[in-house]
């Protein structure tokens, strides 16, 4: 139900709270217009209703909130702050709601929020403090355990003059608030690289999905700290080869399963270590499906069937013998 008391003692980072107050107390736990509510299932669904704001009168019992397929555009600070707070809200799905701006403190005052899905929103402006709620160097820990950010890359003409990867990573690392995060999905975001410090600061990760990006190399990425990692999805990227350091780190993770399908593997002399490792390791799922993309003579060859004689590099000619 809606708050009815003054919000003056509340954080100023939640300006919406103070004004989202019904003039008269609504019926207890009534369902907002355009939404479907099940108190038994603790679920509210406001789906495909072209909402431009988060409903103000959300029932206090809500544990699962679906706000998918709307036109929210912007989530301001305190977008879900209510009096009394939505203390039970554990799963929030905002996918496909045309969000392009998520501000600092957008998810403040949701003490039980464990799952957040922002997928399929063109997030041109994701505040570094969207998840941490404050610009302190160390923030209060976020309760988030699962963060789904698949296909949040905006169209190229709407991206700002900054690295999209950098913007996302800044939000993930701010204030070290997401130390308890166990699942992170970042699929389909056109990532060209993975900033080297991101994984080291998310030590609780069990599941990491980076599939359908444009990652060319993992050379500078360290998986060493991710001792709990159970699944690593790297399908449909632009990976050419995994080098020894990466192979050793992956092999050293006790529970890991790695998915590497549909990458343009380059089967030359630099691939020898990876082929040897693939033949011995159990961590790669569907490793028998991995095939060469380059060079042309090796296209569609199965990596597991290669031997060292297959993996050669064209000799580099001295400059005096190179033609222009």
């Amino acid at each position: 139900s809606s708050p009815t008391s003054s919000a003056s003692s509340f954080s100023s980072s939640a300006p919406f709270l103070a004004s989202a107050v019904s003039a008269q107390p609504p019926l207890p736990d009534q369902c907002p217009a355009l939404c479907e509510c099940s108190e038994a299932a603790r679920t509210v669904k406001c789906v495909n209703r072209n909402l431009t704001e988060v409903p103000t009168d959300l029932p206090a019992y809500v544990r699962n909130l679906f706000l998918t397929g709307n036109q929210l555009a912007v989530l301001p600070a305190g977008a879900f702050a209510r009096r009394p707070p939505l203390a039970e809200l554990a799963a929030l799905n905002l996918s496909g709601s045309r969000l392009d701006e998520v501000r600092a403190g957008a998810f403040e005052h949701l003490p039980s929020l464990r799952q957040l899905d922002l997928s399929h929103n063109p997030l041109a402006d994701l505040s570094p403090f969207a998840f941490s709620g404050s610009n302190a160097s160390v923030s209060a820990p976020s309760p988030l355990v699962e963060l789904i950010l698949n296909h949040i890359v905006p169209p190229e003409d709407e991206r700002q003059n900054r690295s999209f990867e950098g913007m996302v990573v800044a939000a993930l690392l701010a204030g070290r608030a997401l130390q308890g995060l166990r699942r992170l999905e970042l699929a389909s975001n056109h990532f060209l690289y993975l900033p080297r410090d991101v994984l080291a600061q998310l030590p609780s990760l069990r599941h990491l999905d980076l599939s359908n990006n444009s990652l060319v190399s993992l050379t500078y990425v360290s998986f060493r700290n991710l001792t709990h990692l159970e699944s690593l999805h790297l399908e449909d990227n632009a990976l050419k080869v995994l080098h020894n350091g990466t192979l050793a780190e992956l092999q050293g993770l006790p529970h890991i399963r790695v998915f590497l399908d549909n990458n343009p593997w380059v089967c030359d002399c630099h691939m020898a270590d990876m082929v040897t490792w693939l033949k011995e390791t159990e961590v790669v799922q569907g490793k028998d499906r991995l095939t060469c993309a380059y060079p042309e003579k090796m296209r569609n060859r199965v990596l597991l069937e290669l031997n060292s004689a297959d993996l050669d590099c064209d000799p580099i000619l001295p400059p005096s013998l190179q033609t222009s």
Partner: antibody, heavy 120, light 111 residues
Framework: EVQLVESGGGVVQPGRSLRLSCAAS????????MHWVRQAPGKGLEWVAY????????YYADTVKGRFTISRDNSKNTLYLQMNSLRAEDTAVYYC?????????????WGQGTTVTVSS | DIVLTQSPDSLAVSLGERATINCRAS??????????LHWYQQKPGQPPKLLIK???NLESGVPDRFSGSGSGTDFTLTISSLQAEDVAVYYC?????????FGQGTKLEIK
Amino acid sequence: EVQLVESGGGVVQPGRSLRLSCAASGFTFSNFGMHWVRQAPGKGLEWVAYISSGSTSFYYADTVKGRFTISRDNSKNTLYLQMNSLRAEDTAVYYCSRTNSLLRGFFDAWGQGTTVTVSS
Amino acid sequence: DIVLTQSPDSLAVSLGERATINCRASQSVSSSSYTYLHWYQQKPGQPPKLLIKSASNLESGVPDRFSGSGSGTDFTLTISSLQAEDVAVYYCQHSWEIPLTFGQGTKLEIK
């Protein structure tokens, strides 16, 4: 042509109530959020309240919170403002206005206003 | 609450001359996606009318002698060549957060 026509204003004593209406025509009323904005005599503009297109969101200025209630009836293309416990400082011309959304929107159509005078 | 301060409070400009009105916000009202600042014109005895949305976008039907600029905290409304019908009070308004607030208004007259 977009038209917004306010009614229901008048002279009322402090502590009493009044209900304003705003009749909309010339556009699909149910697709737009609506605001009330007021203007005290000789003064500037003051935002009062907002209601979303489907009555899922309601916001109020601190000066009216707990006393005023905004509502709408999309079947009648009408916006309402129920004003209780009126005070002298509520004396103003009250305008209804249309918007496409709360934050990403703006007041792109206005009514002519209705005058509320709170006086003993 | 965000305070919008307009300057000057009143302005007298000759016909055909340029008129400039400023609006300063007490905090930024721009993001990299959108600028949450709009301008209105109110003639005597009439309701306000939207002139400029999102700092610089001319509302349909508004003469192109009106223009807006600015971002962050500082914004400007310019009338490039003042006409007699431009005599009015001009207001800026933000939509960054609740409560929405207006500037105090600038009264524009003909010199």
